[in-house]
Interface confidence: medium
């Protein structure tokens, strides 16, 4: 239901009160007129015009009220109209970066492919918090997600794809460490862990993008 | 409620293929990956893989790769596992069951392999 | 792969007494633990995830702790019900591997 549309039930409900009010009180005086009318019925009828009478100033405060929060939202509104949103659809914001969860399951060559289509890299890692976001992001799913890291060989330090060293403070990479892959070694998160991989397996992925945070 | 309903009991010969499904009851099939599960009294319980049946996208341990094939027919929220060239070792009782973790389980299905 | 080992395949209780059954993981799993109670004939049933949270319907008798590689499941004033086989599983990473079974039995 639309603010507007809350607006109209206020203002009829309104209007039904002040009906309801011009009623009673020509309830009362009828009854003062009559000699068979009690005094104790008569209490009774005031008692309900003045609560009547406090839901209609309160009734009316409740339309100020939706009346001021209508104009700060068509406000608001038309700021965020102003706005692209940080990220594309299906796109998770968090920080300054979008994530995409893939559903394809792909070598990891083809997944940073996937991710090159769609203007973005493969996931990076750079902090601790990251690590907590992605980490809470698949705690549900059972499966292993690529992510941007590879290396050589086991003689070869872990590299993300721009190049950059993994910072050994953020995680230890389990598994296949000590292995030598023709097709290289690359690293998966799943669920709580980082681990070392054949990267011609296929398994799912995280592509991360810069989120566009400037106004227009 | 959330119900798994597992199809027969099964006797097969060496060699064949059989194809036991999974029916899901009482919750959004495709919003849960389904799991498989293998039991015998020599290995235990032993999991076999798993599909999530919005994408399709599935995991198995390395030792059924090629022995069992998961897929999921989201019309009819049914589950399936087929489990390929047959022998002894395949006999067992095999559990559907939806994760996170494995909160409901089918009744089992038992497989007997046998000429 | 990561092993699962609980150390007694078989425990004998008196009724009303206190069971405690370990699990041993060959690697840490950062609490990522299950345990799983199965009656004869039927299939397992999950009583604790997380290695901590009693599942809904799960008398409170039953409690789970631990942290690394070690994890306990403990029964408190133990009942005829509880007579069952248990089973932990780690499900950090696959393959999810299951404990060999502790089989419980009253005295």
């Known amino acids: 239901m639309q603010l507007s549309q809350v607006s109209d039930l206020l203002t009829q409900e309104q209007a039904n009160l002040t009906h309801q009010k011009k009623k009673l009180e020509g309830q009362i005086s009828a009854r003062q007129q009559a000699e068979e009318a009690s005094q104790e019925s008569e209490n009774e009828l005031k008692e309900m015009i003045e609560t009547l009478a406090r839901k209609l100033n309160e009734k009316s405060k409740e339309q100020m009220e939706l009346h001021h929060q209508n104009l700060n939202l068509q406000e608001t509104l038309k700021r965020v109209a102003n706005c692209s949103a940080p990220c594309p659809q299906d796109w998770i914001w968090h920080g300054e970066n979008c994530y995409l969860f893939s559903s394809g399951s792909f070598n990891w060559e083809k997944s940073q492919e996937k991710c090159l289509s769609l203007d973005a890299k493969l996931l990076k890692i750079n902090s601790t918090a990251d690590l907590d976001f992605i980490q809470q992001a698949i705690s549900y799913s059972s499966f292993p997600f690529w992510m941007g890291l590879s290396r050589r060989n086991p003689s070869y330090p872990w590299l993300w794809e721009d190049g950059s060293p993994l910072m050994p403070h953020l995680f230890r990479v389990r598994g296949a460490v000590s292995q030598t892959y023709p097709s290289g070694t690359c690293a998966y998160i799943q669920r709580g862990a980082v681990y070392a991989e054949n990267c011609i397996l296929a398994a799912f992925s995280i592509c991360q993008k810069k989120a566009n945070l400037r106004a227009q | 409620q959330v119900q798994l309903q597992q199809s027969g009991a099964e006797l097969v010969r060496p060699g064949a293929s059989v194809k036991l499904s999974c029916k899901a009851l009482?919750?959004?099939?495709?919003?849960?990956?389904m799991h498989w599960v293998k039991q015998t009294p020599v290995h235990g319980l032993e999991w076999i893989g798993a599909?999530?049946?919005?994408?399709?996208?599935?995991a198995y341990i390395q030792k059924f790769k090629g022995k069992a094939t998961l897929t999921a027919d989201k019309s009819s929220s049914t589950a399936h596992m087929e489990l390929s060239s047959l022998t002894s070792e395949d006999s067992a009782v095999y559990y559907c069951?939806?994760?996170?973790?494995?909160?409901?389980w089918g009744q089992g299905t038992s497989v007997t392999v046998s000429s | 792969d990561i092993q699962m080992t609980q150390s007694s395949s078989y425990l004998s209780v008196s009724l009303g007494g206190r069971v405690t059954i370990t699990c041993k993981a060959s690697?840490?799993?950062?609490?990522?633990l299950a345990w799983y109670q199965q009656k004869p004939g039927n299939a397992p049933r999950l009583l604790i995830s997380?290695?901590?949270s009693l599942e809904t319907g799960v008398p409170s008798r039953f409690s789970g702790s631990g942290s690394g590689k070690d994890y306990t499941l403990s029964i408190t004033g133990l009942q005829t019900e509880d007579v069952a086989t248990y089973y932990c599983?780690?499900?950090?990473?696959?393959?999810?591997?299951f404990g060999g079974g502790t089989k419980l039995e009253i005295k």
């Open positions: 690697d840490h799993i950062n609490n990522w």
């Open positions: 599909i999530h049946p919005g994408s399709g996208g599935a």
């Open positions: 997380g290695a901590t």
């Open positions: 069951t939806r994760w996170l973790p494995m909160d409901y």
């Open positions: 009482g919750y959004t099939f495709t919003d849960y990956e």
């Open positions: 599983q780690q499900y950090l990473i696959t393959p999810y591997t």
